[in-house]
Structure formats: structure tokens, C-alpha cells
């Protein structure tokens, strides 16, 4: 006996109660492939989720996050609260980054400032809660007598000639 269900297209299901007739998916359900024996319930975008694409008989709804939240996971399976730059989301909500750490985004965690000395460099611009430090030349490059393509002009006080 040939399985008549394989003839049922997407958007329908094979109704065993009706001699394997292809019946349309009921409202708020879909089947994205042919030959289905049931239709899947459409995803509902509620609360912090908003609808990006409505459900149809052949495809599920797609959700985004409302303003102030961002998507996490495949197909926006979660919405996570945004924080301000310089903060991270903790068990108690958005909290400022601890001294020595920064976050330049509305999501994610506070990360430690770059340790310039590990690369033999000096701190050119100090770090903040929102920004990493900027590393500059190594201290050796800045010391007197260090060779460079353009030697620095000698520092002198006004009215004094160089020795």
C-alpha cells in the first residue's frame, strides 16, 4: 500500500483520521516540509520578544528582541538586557565594571585592561570603564640616547643654551 502521506505538501499534514487526506495546517501552526503527520505550533513573540516575521502555514515565526535587549542563541532563542558601556550584566542587574576592567559594548562582560608592560610597552592613554588602555612605545624607546629615525629635540629651559 503506497503511503499517501508523502504526497502532502508543506503547509499541510497527513490526517490519519480522514484516510490520509492532506489537511491544511490549523491556524497558528505550520509544516515546513512535505509528508508531515502533524503541524508544529507557531512560535509566539511575546514580552521581550517582538515579531520579525509572521508565522505562515509553511514557516515558523521569527522573533527579535525589543529595544533595550539583544538576541542570544540560535534564531534569537533568548533576549538579554542591554547595559551601558562600562557595565556588565550580573546576577543583580547591570553593574559598573570594576577598576582595571572595561566594556565598550552594551553586552558582554567587563574585560581586563591590556597590560602594556607584557609587550614591553608603556601606557599612552589610561583605561576607563568604557575603554581599554592605549599602549605606546616601550619605555626604552622614550629614554634619552635611544636611537630613532628622528632624534627628539633637546629639552631646555628658555634662556639657556644647550651644553
Amino acid at each position: 500500500l503506497q503511503d499517501l502521506c508523502s504526497n502532502c505538501p508543506a503547509g499541510t499534514f497527513c490526517d490519519n483520521n480522514r484516510s490520509q487526506i492532506c489537511s491544511p495546517c490549523p491556524p497558528n501552526s505550520f509544516s515546513s516540509a512535505g509528508g508531515q503527520r502533524t503541524c508544529d505550533i507557531c512560535r509566539q513573540c511575546k514580552g521581550v520578544f517582538k515579531t520579525r516575521k509572521e508565522c505562515s502555514s509553511t514557516s515558523n515565526a521569527e522573533c527579535d528582541c525589543i529595544s533595550g535587549y539583544h538576541c542570544l542563541g540560535a534564531e534569537c532563542s533568548m533576549c538579554e538586557q542591554d547595559c551601558k558601556q562600562g557595565q556588565e550584566l550580573t546576577k543583580k542587574g547591570c553593574k559598573d565594571c570594576c577598576f582595571g576592567t572595561f566594556n565598550d559594548q552594551k553586552r558582554g562582560i567587563c574585560r581586563p585592561w591590556t597590560n602594556c608592560s607584557l609587550d614591553g610597552k608603556s601606557v599612552l592613554v589610561n583605561g576607563t570603564k568604557e575603554r581599554d588602555v592605549v599602549c605606546g612605545p616601550s619605555p626604552a624607546d622614550l629614554s634619552p640616547g635611544a636611537s630613532s629615525a628622528t632624534p627628539p629635540a633637546p629639552a631646555r629651559e628658555p634662556g639657556h643654551s644647550p651644553q
Epitope: K46, G47, G73, M78, C79, E80, Q81, K91, G93
Partner: nanobody, 122 residues
Framework: QVQLVESGGGLVQPGGSLRLSCAAS????????MSWARQAPGKDFEWVSY???????YYADSVKGRFTISRDNAKNTVYLQMNSLKPEDTAVYYC????????????????WGQGTQVTVSS
């Protein structure tokens, strides 16, 4: 069919109190963590309070000391007692399940109520 139905909202003067209720049906309420969230006109949606299945609670800094979340598993209901209300508490308040157990994060399997309006004004 899962349902969350909020009630208890209304108009109250600054300094006044309200108790919101959220009646749950269609799922095993006692094993779910629950949350209250709110959205004020022109403001971002924000979480207010959470309660774990074991009764442990979390509060947003903005409501700490004024709001109390509680649950009655026998009645499948979660409550939000709101005292010392301020005009900035004016919002639509939503009740929702809380699968992720991560503050500020909800997932696609969470259930949401339709919301109840709270207006704090003299």
C-alpha cells in the same frame, strides 16, 4: 493551554500601595521560577523582581525595599506587593515565567501575561 492573568493594577496616589496578582494555569507552577517586569511609556522594558521555585528572590535596585515578590504554590499565584509608590513606577506590569534563571534574560519558552496598568499620580 498555558495562561498567566495579571490583576490588581489601577490608579494610586504617590506613597500609596497596590498588590498585583498573577494567576497561572496550564503548567506545573510550583517548579517554575517567576518574574515581574514593567514597561513605562517611552522607556525600555525592565525587570522588576524574580522569585525562584524555592522562594528565593531578586529585586531591581529601583524597587528594592519598596516592592515584595511572593508566591502561593497552592493557589498557582505570584504576587507583587508595591509600597511607597512613586510616579516613576507608572507602567504596564507583566508577569512571566523565567526559564533562564539569569537576571535580565528570558527565553523563547517563557510564558507571558497580557499585563496590568499601574498609574501613580496625584
Amino acid at each position: 493551554q498555558v495562561q498567566l492573568v495579571e490583576s490588581g493594577g489601577g490608579l494610586v496616589q504617590p506613597g500609596g500601595s497596590l498588590r498585583l496578582s498573577c494567576a497561572a494555569s496550564g503548567f506545573t507552577f510550583s517548579s517554575y521560577a517567576m518574574s515581574w517586569a514593567r514597561q513605562a511609556p517611552g522607556k525600555d522594558f525592565e525587570w522588576v523582581s524574580y522569585i525562584y521555585s524555592d522562594g528565593n528572590t531578586y529585586y531591581a535596585d529601583s524597587v528594592k525595599g519598596r516592592f515584595t515578590i511572593s508566591r502561593d504554590n497552592a493557589k498557582n499565584t505570584v504576587y507583587l506587593q508595591m509600597n511607597s509608590l512613586k510616579p516613576e513606577d507608572t507602567a504596564v506590569y507583566y508577569c512571566a515565567t523565567w526559564h533562564t534563571l539569569r537576571v535580565g534574560v528570558w527565553d523563547e519558552y517563557d510564558y507571558w501575561g497580557q499585563g496590568t496598568q499601574v498609574t501613580v499620580s496625584s
